[in-house]
Interface confidence: low
Amino acid sequence: MKVLQEPTCVSDYMSISTCEWKMNGPTNCSTELRLLYQLVFLLSEAHTCIPENNGGAGCVCHLLMDDVVSADNYTLDLWAGQQLLWKGSFKPSEHVKPRAPGNLTVHTNVSDTLLLTWSNPYPPDNYLYNHLTYAVNIWSENDPADFRIYNVTYLEPSLRIAASTLKSGISYRARVRAWAQCYNTTWSEWSPSTKWHNSYREPFEQH
């Protein structure tokens, strides 16, 4: 049994880091493998993560970390029984993937303006709370070419757009994701999408 693709990990900078890797053949990750992780300098006995299957030869492990600070550095040991398959390290603050925003809502009753709001996925005492910016994706269910991205570079989790910038009388979907420049994070996963019917009064034609 060998590791084909070494573990790569990302942290949500709150409570979970996720590590993924591939074995050289079909593996029952949860019964055959264990990922041990320890905080360098400040260690107790290792914490053990039981991996799950992620495709035939792929494994994924969710490491529980009750909090994260920028100085934290973890050692990682991947074991198959008594055999050490791989040894590495992971600094969560250097590999951050924010949590996805939630509660995306489209308010359509504001005078021909669409107001999209969502929730910041972090509590106020988390460092990322005041450092997230967002991308909102809006697309038409009827027209695959009608696909647009709005960058929200201010802190407020909301976006206003004129309903008239979208086609009237058809259904649209929206989703939102987040990133934080301060830690040069990757983008979060997209939030669940929300659907609405876009309708607005066309202005009277001028003759």
């Epitope: 905080l39 300098f41 400040l42 107790s44 009750d66 909090d67 100085a71 005492d125 988390n126």
Partner: antibody
Framework: QVQLVESGGGVVQPGRSLRLSCAAS????????MHWVRQAPGKGLEWVAV????????YYADSVKGRFTISRDNSKNTLYLQMNSLRAEDTAVYYC???????????????WGQGTLVTVSS | EIVLTQSPATLSLSPGERATLSCRAS??????LAWYQQKPGQAPRLLIY???NRATGIPARFSGSGSGTDFTLTISSLEPEDFAVYYC?????????FGGGTKVEIK
């Protein structure tokens, strides 16, 4: 209950060396990160050094880096601080501390020894 | 390094009074701040960790609050045994640092 007993303090001339020891009992010593913290007479607390549970990783305050070495012998449940090139400003009570595990991190000090006084004077 | 500034340096109060101690960090430490109590001739004792969590065996009259750069330790009603020096400490970044201390003395 947890017990930490420091020894090895005393009066030493500037530039000389001293080794402090800390005998630990009442907990699984080999599973804990351990620290030294010092306190100059009438002054506040200053963190000095940390060593990981297995002795493979150490970290130091800038004021002692290159002069002090933290080490441990898990078979003897003992923590050490080797202090070289001592200066007058190293005069302090040196505390051996066990850190409490909160969220897997070991940086809050829940157990302290009684301290041992190191005086650097000519 | 993160500098912790405690104020006031000395607090003169009577038993039964409320004590409010402040600790300000030179940069954000999130909630990674602890408070210790030290009596003359004794080693420090952990009171509060992660800004607001009481350590084992610490009476409910001790409470901590704050996040980011501003933190407060409150003793709701001073008992005679509470007159001591109090230190804050951060673990957000290396090196670990302590504040200069606040002495709570009997008025």
């Amino acid at each position: 209950q947890v017990q930490l007993v420091e020894s090895g303090g005393g009066v030493v001339q500037p530039g000389r060396s001293l080794r402090l020891s800390c005998a630990a009992s009442g907990f699984t010593f080999s599973s804990n990160g351990m620290h030294w913290v010092r306190q100059a007479p009438g002054k506040g607390l200053e963190w000095v050094a940390v060593i990981s549970y297995d002795g493979n990783n150490q970290y130091y305050a800038d004021s002692v880096k290159g002069r002090f070495t933290i080490s441990r012998d898990n078979s003897k449940n003992t923590l050490y601080l080797q202090m070289n090139s001592l200066r007058a400003e190293d005069t302090a009570v040196y505390y051996c501390t066990k850190a409490i595990s909160i969220s897997g991190t070991y940086n809050w000090f829940d157990s302290w020894g009684q301290g041992t006084l190191v005086t650097v004077s000519s | 390094e993160i500098v912790l500034t405690q104020s006031p340096a000395t607090l003169s109060l009577s038993p039964g009074e409320r004590a409010t101690l402040s600790c300000r960090a030179s940069q954000s430490v999130s909630r990674y701040l602890a408070w210790y109590q030290q009596k003359p001739g004794q080693a420090p004792r952990l009171l509060i960790y992660d800004a607001s969590n009481r350590a084992t065996g610490i009476p409910a009259r001790f409470s901590g609050s704050g996040s980011g750069t501003d933190f407060t330790l409150t003793i709701s009603s001073l008992e005679p045994e509470d007159f001591a020096v109090y230190y804050c400490q951060q673990r957000s970044n290396w090196p670990l640092t302590f504040g200069g201390g606040t002495k709570v003395e009997i008025k």
